[in-house]
């Protein structure tokens, strides 16, 4: 058993049929010694008396808010949550496996630049009685500070018969050094509590590996005289690290119709302009990627050919 | 050329070669990105490699003030990785695929380090750690980790030279 926060405790249980469970001793936070009784949740049934209460925690029915009273007055609470371990593996019932970039990916994180700011998100089908708490650091043995905000519900989607909820959190490294080569990864830890179930999820990454630039901005077309060709120009996204002579991007320019199966023109460039062939009913799209490190491509920025 | 005396390097040549190094480092092991090597005790294994750190003057301001500190750090790293790629970690079993770009990568690391420090000038170099894995699978894992680390190192070096070529070239 360990303390998650004040008056909230996590009991770690090996979860299998007829498991013996864990013996837990609760102590009432009071100077009083006599006349103390214990109850669980909203029940008025007295579970025991005395300053301490010893319980055998085996299942969710044994978890909940234990309250010690004296003469009708509440003295203190202890909330017990369960953390299940099945076949040596901690349960991951609360969050959905996003399976990208690999199986057992519950947290996904992205950074728009090298400033040390990043966003993580996760998915669940649970809509109520759900809380998250996020902590982060650079390195684990001698951790350096990363400050995370509160996790918020950022999207709701319908997937078949189910509703899916996306939560996200923004974090910022306290003393970021955008130009340095990272040697220690960022660690992100998410505590998830659903009703009386506790789970924790972690992710470890370098900012360089989660970089995904915003799409290029201000796409403009200039038809070339006596030619089917069009000069397309664009600018670096505002959110990208500066100076651009140091933090350079490379671009992919593509002309394609509505369907991915249609024929296309495609060219890669380090410049912020390119010459392509425009077709009726097609769009010109441009996306960006770090020039020197193969992290994710941005989403496409598009303009119609016409 | 960057020499201990403090003259400028051939920024444009260094830029071209460092960008080539980036391409080679990724073609040497493109799928490395899909392996979570940190699960294999990454902090201990590759902490010995020289990293370009915050105080090394490789940021745009530091380069403007005095590029020598940064260039010396890059040179140290190039020599270090060049020795690693020539060591039995890469030459031992399991043999590299004949079409592996590691050979080209090795030669390009040497080429860039010589551009930075011509014969007759000597900057301090870092001792190469004795990373001699006994098992072929350990060697394979170490190769992945070294290449992964090299990808990050050459990316910073390429940024330095690109910025230098754009803003510090005579």
């Amino acid at each position: 058993i360990w303390e998650l926060k004040k008056d909230v405790y996590v009991v770690e249980l090996d979860w299998y049929p007829d498991a013996p469970g864990e013996m837990v001793v609760l102590t009432c936070d009071t100077p009083e010694e006599d006349g103390i009784t214990w109850t669980l949740d909203q029940s008025s049934e007295v579970l025991g008396s005395g300053k301490t209460l010893t319980i055998q925690v085996k299942e969710f029915g044994d978890a909940g808010q234990y309250t010690c009273h004296k003469g009708g007055e509440v003295l203190s609470h202890s909330l017990l949550l369960l953390h299940k371990k099945e076949d040596g593996i901690w349960s991951t019932d609360i969050l959905k496996d996003q399976k990208e970039p690999k199986n057992k990916t519950f947290l996904r994180c992205e950074a728009k630049n090298y400033s040390g700011r990043f966003t993580c998100w996760w998915l669940t089908t649970i809509s109520t009685d759900l809380t998250f708490s996020v902590k982060s650091s650079r390195g684990s043995s001698d951790p350096q500070g990363v400050t995370c905000g509160a996790a918020t519900l950022s999207a709701e989607r319908v997937r078949g018969d189910n509703k899916e909820y996306e939560y996200s959190v923004e974090c910022q490294e306290d003393s970021a050094c955008p130009a340095a080569e990272e040697s220690l990864p960022i660690e992100v830890m998410v505590d998830a509590v659903h009703k009386l179930k506790y789970e924790n999820y972690t992710s470890s990454f370098f900012i360089r590996d989660i970089i995904k630039p915003d799409p290029p901005k201000n796409l403009q077309l200039k038809p070339l005289k006596n030619s089917r060709q069009v000069e397309v120009s664009w600018e670096y996204p505002d959110t990208w690290s500066t100076p651009h002579s140091y933090f350079s991007l490379t671009f992919c320019v593509q002309v394609q119709g509505k369907s991915k199966r249609e024929k296309k023109d495609r060219v890669f460039t380090d410049k912020t302009s390119a010459t392509v062939i425009c077709r009726k009913n097609a769009s010109i799209s441009v996306r960006a990627q770090d020039r020197y490190y193969s992290s994710s491509w941005s989403e496409w920025a598009s303009v119609p050919c016409s | 050329r960057a020499v201990p005396g403090g003259s400028s390097p051939a920024w444009t040549q260094c830029q071209q070669l460092s960008q080539k190094l980036c391409t080679l480092a990724w073609s040497a092991h493109p799928l490395v990105g899909h392996m979570d090597l940190r699960e294999e005790g990454d902090e201990e294994t590759t902490n010995d490699v020289p990293h370009i750190q915050c105080g090394d003057g490789c940021d745009p301001q530091g380069l403007r003030d005095n590029s020598q500190f940064c260039l010396q750090r890059i040179h140290q790293g190039l020599i270090f990785y060049e020795k690693l790629l020539g060591s039995d970690i890469f030459t031992g079993e399991p043999s590299l695929l004949p079409d592996s770009p590691v050979g080209q990568l090795h030669a390009s690391l040497l080429g860039l380090s010589q551009l930075l420090q011509p014969e007759g000038h000597h900057w301090e170099t870092q001792q190469i750690p004795s990373l001699s894995p006994s098992q072929p699978w350990q060697r394979l894992l170490l190769r992945f980790k070294i290449l992964r680390s090299l990808q990050a190192f050459v990316a910073v070096a390429a940024r330095v030279f690109a910025h230098g070529a754009a803003t510090l070239s005579p």
């Epitope: 296309k264 060219v267 | 073609s27």
Partner: antibody, heavy 118, light 107 residues
Framework: QVQLVQSGAEVKKPGASVKVSCKAS????????LHWVRQAPGQGLEWMGW????????EYAPKFQGRVTMTTDTSTSTAYMELRSLRSDDTAVYYC???????????WGQGTMVTVSS | EIVMTQSPATLSVSPGERATLSCRAS??????LHWYQQKPGQAPRLLIY???QSISGIPARFSGSGSGTEFTLTISSLQSEDFAVHYC?????????FGGGTKVEIK
């Protein structure tokens, strides 16, 4: 599978014109760009231009501008390349090729030998 | 127009050995570079597109690398059917241009 079958060899006099055909099969004709590339005997490859069979748009290499015309007949899935004012140095194998991507060449025809000789 | 230069013009290699073919562009072309193989009396066939992307059906012994102005086609272990002329082609800008070719011959 995608296939391109070209017309047979031609012998022409200097100053004449030649029209080479290229019949496509195995795909929707308007879904691919069509290019023409030539190769003089013992020499390298030289790009001449492309046509979009969907709308007849063309782009020719400056060297051939004014002397070459590329056309298509969608009813027969056939592309044509006409080269006028032939000279002896136009002696070459002429290839048509097709691709969904505009700038490189995936599927090639077998080639048509055009000999220009007086 | 962009001029593509291939070297060497002829490469003599023994079967089973590795062949490294070079292609240089007269200006930076990013990764807009493609490789073809042509055997005598046949049309060329595409081996690699966008500098390093492999084509299904092409043996894994063919690999490409490079960006900017310098590119390499590597044939890891030459088989008898690989002895042919290999061309690079840039697609950075029109007109599309080819290198002069490298003939890979049996040593």
């Amino acid at each position: 599978q995608v296939q391109l079958v070209q017309s047979g060899a031609e012998v022409k006099k200097p100053g004449a014109s030649v029209k080479v055909s290229c019949k496509a099969s195995g795909y929707t004709f308007t879904d691919y760009y069509l290019h023409w590339v030539r190769q003089a005997p013992g020499q390298g490859l030289e790009w001449m231009g492309w046509i979009d069979p969907e709308n007849g748009d063309t782009e020719y290499a400056p060297k051939f501008q004014g002397r070459v015309t590329m056309t298509t007949d969608t009813s027969t899935s056939t592309a044509y390349m006409e080269l006028r004012s032939l000279r002896s140095d136009d002696t070459a194998v002429y290839y048509c090729n097709a691709n969904k991507e505009l700038r490189y060449f995936d599927v090639w025809g077998q080639g048509t030998m055009v000999t220009v000789s007086s | 127009e962009i001029v593509m230069t291939q070297s060497p013009a002829t490469l003599s290699v023994s079967p089973g050995e590795r062949a490294t073919l070079s292609c240089r562009a007269s200006q930076s072309i990013s990764i807009n570079l493609h490789w073809y193989q042509q055997k005598p009396g046949q049309a060329p066939r595409l081996l690699i597109y966008f500098a390093s992307q492999s084509i299904s059906g092409i043996p894994a012994r063919f690999s490409g690398s490079g960006s900017g102005t310098e590119f390499t086609l590597t044939i890891s272990s030459l088989q008898s059917e690989d002895f042919a002329v290999h061309y690079c082609q840039q697609s950075n800008s029109f007109p599309l241009t080819f290198g002069g070719g490298t003939k890979v011959e049996i040593k």
